[in-house]
């Protein structure tokens, strides 16, 4: 039968715990991202600002992941208006504060 | 590692039936969409059916609407093809895929494919 | 019912630059994946999201989409890029896959 959405978004979930648990040298290479207001933007906002990061096979399959949550298409800076105060953080902060609201999400119910 | 195996296919009459299986191991099936994408000797790529993951939505091409029915038994991590009124054109290789993650799993990319499994519809 | 189309064949020298076009009706609003096939072989995914690489694919390939067109690169064509190139995308609820180019690497 059907299965509910959340089983995805634990996918993702622990995709984001095995990137920081596997952590050893800087996550792509010390890479900068847009910090952005993921309560505001969510999932596609989230690609947006990942979608910069190239040649970083550690979050490539985060990146697939979250396009999966985002019914259009994404390019780099689509969501520029989203971006905190035109902050840029560290791919590995990113991603910690990306897990922490996926988290939130879960526990919530809030699936979509 | 992500494994796919197809089976199920052979030689059938032209309107008949045949079920094609595909067993998967190495991934956390129930939670990603899945496809079965065909190959007719000596053509292109013509994707057939899809079954997402996270709402239990299905997807058919126009060639095979009402004719092929897509399933899935999540206990078992294996996806179905049931195949009915089967014609010469149907013949082909027919591969299973593994799909994205969540409603718009379409956006993720076909990485791993099945070796494939031959149908031939014949008389 | 959306269709992508690829010029049937491309002819490239080793070392030298081989291109491939997908075309279809506004194609650049969509995700574009490209897939290498070789004879008896499954079908391997070399770009999603229409210019990314998965793991293992080597840099020679690159793909860009804008408009109605797709394009995948590979640079310094070797002899083990011979094969077939399929475009591919996602329009009203179905995959679309393109016509198919065989590439041949010629000497």
């Known amino acids: 039968g059907p299965v509910p959405p959340s089983t995805a978004l634990r996918e993702l979930i622990e995709e984001l715990v095995n990137i920081t648990q596997n952590q050893k040298a800087p996550l792509c290479n010390g890479s900068m991202v847009w910090s952005i207001n993921l309560t505001a933007g969510g999932f596609c906002v989230a690609l947006d600002s990942l979608t910069n990061v190239s040649g970083c096979s550690a979050i490539e399959k985060t990146q697939r992941m979250l396009s999966g949550f985002c019914p259009h298409k994404v390019s780099a800076g689509q969501f520029s208006s989203l971006h905190v105060r035109d902050t840029k953080i560290e791919v590995a902060q990113f991603v910690k504060d990306l897990l922490l609201h996926l988290k939130k999400l879960f526990r919530e119910g809030q699936f979509n | 590692e992500v494994q796919l195996l197809e089976s199920g296919g052979g030689l059938v009459q032209p309107g008949g039936s045949l079920r094609l299986s595909c067993a998967a191991s190495?991934?956390?099936?129930?939670?990603?969409?899945m496809s079965w994408v065909r190959q007719a000797p000596g053509k292109g790529l013509e994707w057939v059916s899809a079954f997402s993951g996270s709402g239990g939505s299905t997807y058919y091409a126009d060639s095979v609407k009402g004719r092929f029915t897509i399933s899935r038994d999540n206990s078992k991590n294996t996806l179905y093809l049931q195949m009915n009124s089967l014609r010469a054109e149907d013949t082909a290789v027919y591969y299973c895929v593994q799909d994205g993650l969540g409603p718009y799993f379409y956006n993720y990319g076909m990485d791993v494919w099945g070796q494939g499994t031959t149908v031939t519809v014949s008389s | 019912s959306y269709e992508l189309t690829q010029p049937p064949s491309v002819s490239v020298s080793p070392g030298q630059t081989a291109s491939i076009t997908c075309s279809g009706d506004k194609l650049g609003d969509k995700y574009t994946c490209w897939f290498q096939q070789k004879p008896g072989q499954s079908p391997v995914l070399v770009i999603y999201?229409?210019?990314k690489r998965p793991s293992g694919i080597p840099e020679r390939f690159s793909g860009s989409n804008s408009g109605d067109t797709a394009t995948l690169t590979i640079s310094g064509t070797q002899a083990m890029d011979e094969a077939d190139y399929y475009c591919q995308a996602w329009d009203s609820s179905t995959y679309v896959f393109g016509t198919g180019t065989k590439v041949t690497v010629l000497g």
């Open positions: 999201h229409d210019s």
């Open positions: 190495g991934f956390t099936f129930s939670s990603y969409a």
